[in-house]
C-alpha cells in the first residue's frame, strides 16, 4: 500500500506518518513514531510561535528600540510577538513599526484635520474661506475668523487663511 | 443545534453518476474539516473521504480513488461527494461527519475524532 | 494501509456486567484511535477520543485504554442502553480505517 500523502490540518507528514504538531508557544524537539508522541517544549523566555508549528527553533521577541523612538505597546508571550509603538510625538513608518518619524505639524495657512496616532502622521487640511491658522502645529485646526458684528465693530482688515479679521469701532456720523 | 443532513441518495444504474451534499448548521463550518463515511447494509463502517476546513487538502479511500471527489462550499455551509463510474459495491448508507480536534492546552498533543454525524442518505446502485 | 482488528465480534452479557472490546492494530498509532457506539438506524456516536478520553455527556461507565497497537473498550456496569454494536477507528494518518465491529447483545 502507498505511504500516506496527506495529513490532517494539526499534523504534518514526516516519514511516512502522520505526527502532531507541536501547539502555539511550543517548538519541536522530536518528530513520532509509530510508539511515540510529537515531542515538544515550551519557547523560551523572549520567544514564540505563533501558530500549529514543527519549528525547531522559537522566534525571537521584536525589541522596541528606544533610540528609534520605540517603546513597547503590547509585551509578548511565548504564543505572540511583542508589539511596538512609538513616543509621545511620533509615529511609526510602516505597519511593522520597526522606526519612528515626528508627527508633521500644519503649517500657517492649514489646519489639522486628524491628530497623529502612534500608527498614523497628521493629517493637514488648508483653511477654507472664512477660516484660518496663524500657527504651524500638529494639533491646531482652523479657527473660524472673528465675527466683528457681534461685538458691534466693523471690519478694518479682511482675514485669510493665515490671519484673522481685524475689527474696529464703527465711524461715528457726525451732526 | 449542530446538525449534518445529507441528500441526494437514491437509486442509480452501474456506470451511473450521484452527487450527495451535506448541510451543515449551527456551528462555523468553515473552520472543520469534514469526512464522508459509508455502511453497506448489514456490513460494518468504511471512511470514504476527507477535506480539509479551506478545500486545500482532500483524500479518498482506496476503493473510491478516482472515482469520487469531495469538495466543499463554506459561503453555503455545503459538502458534497460526486460519485462517478458507481459499481454495485457503492451500494450503503452515507453519512457525512465532522472531525473535531480535541486539545487541551495543558496537554501535549491532542487528538481528532468525528463527533457529529449526519442522519445519512441511501445511495443504492443496481441494474 | 493500518488494518484494525476487534474482538469479540459479537458478545453476549447481561445488565450489570463488565465487559472489555480490544481493537488491535496492524502498526502503532500512537493513542490516535477513537470508538464510537451505532444503534440500528441511526449514525455512529462517538465516546473516546485519544485512546482514552471521554467525549462529553458520555456516561463515565465507558473508558479507553492503550497506545500503540493494543487498546481497550471497557464498560464498568451494562446499562440496557448500551446494547449495540461498537468501532474502533484509526485517525493517525490516512486512510482512516475502522474496525469490523463489536456487536453486544443481551443475554
Known amino acids: 500500500p502507498e505511504p500516506p500523502t496527506a495529513c490532517r490540518e494539526k499534523q504534518y507528514l514526516i516519514n511516512s506518518q502522520c505526527c502532531s504538531l507541536c501547539q502555539p508557544g511550543q517548538k519541536l524537539v522530536s518528530d513520532c513514531t509509530e510508539f511515540t508522541e510529537t515531542e515538544c517544549l515550551p519557547c523560551g523566555e523572549s520567544e514564540f510561535l505563533d501558530t500549529w508549528n514543527r519549528e525547531t527553533h522559537c522566534h525571537q521577541h521584536k525589541y522596541c528600540d528606544p533610540n528609534l523612538g520605540l517603546r513597547v505597546q503590547q509585551k509578548g508571550t511565548s504564543e505572540t510577538d511583542t508589539i511596538c509603538t512609538c513616543e509621545e510625538g511620533w509615529h511609526c513608518t510602516s505597519e511593522a513599526c520597526e522606526s519612528c518619524v515626528l508627527h508633521r505639524s500644519c503649517s500657517p495657512g492649514f489646519g489639522v484635520k486628524q491628530i497623529a496616532t502612534g500608527v498614523s502622521d497628521t493629517i493637514c487640511e488648508p483653511c477654507p474661506v472664512g477660516f484660518f491658522s496663524n500657527v504651524s502645529s500638529a494639533f491646531e485646526k482652523c479657527h473660524p475668523w472673528t465675527s466683528c458684528e457681534t461685538k458691534d465693530l466693523v471690519v478694518q482688515q479682511a482675514g485669510t487663511n493665515k490671519t484673522d479679521v481685524v475689527c474696529g469701532p464703527q465711524d461715528r456720523l457726525r451732526a | 443545534e449542530v446538525q449534518l443532513l445529507e441528500s441526494g441518495g437514491g437509486l442509480v444504474r452501474p456506470g451511473g453518476s450521484l452527487r450527495l451534499s451535506c448541510a451543515a448548521s449551527?456551528?462555523?463550518?468553515?473552520?472543520?474539516?469534514m469526512n464522508w463515511v459509508r455502511q453497506a447494509p448489514g456490513k460494518g463502517l468504511e471512511w470514504v473521504s476527507y477535506i480539509s476546513s479551506s478545500g486545500e487538502t482532500t483524500d479518498y479511500a482506496d476503493s473510491v480513488k478516482g472515482r469520487f471527489t469531495v469538495s466543499r462550499d463554506n459561503s453555503k455551509n455545503l459538502l458534497y461527494l460526486q460519485m462517478n463510474s458507481l459499481r454495485a459495491e457503492d451500494t450503503a448508507v452515507y453519512y457525512c461527519?465532522?472531525?473535531?480536534?480535541?486539545?487541551?492546552?495543558?496537554?501535549?498533543?491532542?487528538?481528532?475524532?468525528?463527533?457529529?454525524w449526519g442522519q445519512g442518505t441511501m445511495v443504492t446502485v443496481s441494474s | 494501509d493500518i488494518q484494525l482488528t476487534q474482538s469479540p465480534s459479537s458478545l453476549t452479557a447481561s445488565v450489570g456486567d463488565r465487559v472489555t472490546i480490544t481493537c488491535r492494530s496492524s502498526q502503532g498509532i500512537r493513542s490516535s484511535l477513537a470508538w464510537y457506539q451505532q444503534k440500528p438506524g441511526k449514525p455512529p456516536k462517538l465516546l473516546i477520543y485519544g485512546a482514552s478520553s471521554l467525549e462529553g455527556g458520555v456516561p463515565s461507565r465507558f473508558s479507553g485504554s492503550g497506545s500503540g497497537t493494543d487498546f481497550t473498550l471497557t464498560i464498568s456496569s451494562l446499562q440496557p442502553e448500551d446494547f449495540a454494536t461498537y468501532y474502533c477507528q484509526q485517525l493517525n494518518s490516512f486512510p482512516s480505517t475502522f474496525g469490523q465491529g463489536t456487536k453486544l447483545e443481551i443475554k
Open positions: 461527519a465532522r472531525d473535531v480536534f480535541f486539545f487541551d492546552s495543558s496537554g501535549d498533543n491532542g487528538a481528532y475524532g468525528m463527533d457529529v
Open positions: 449551527g456551528f462555523t463550518f468553515g473552520s472543520y474539516e
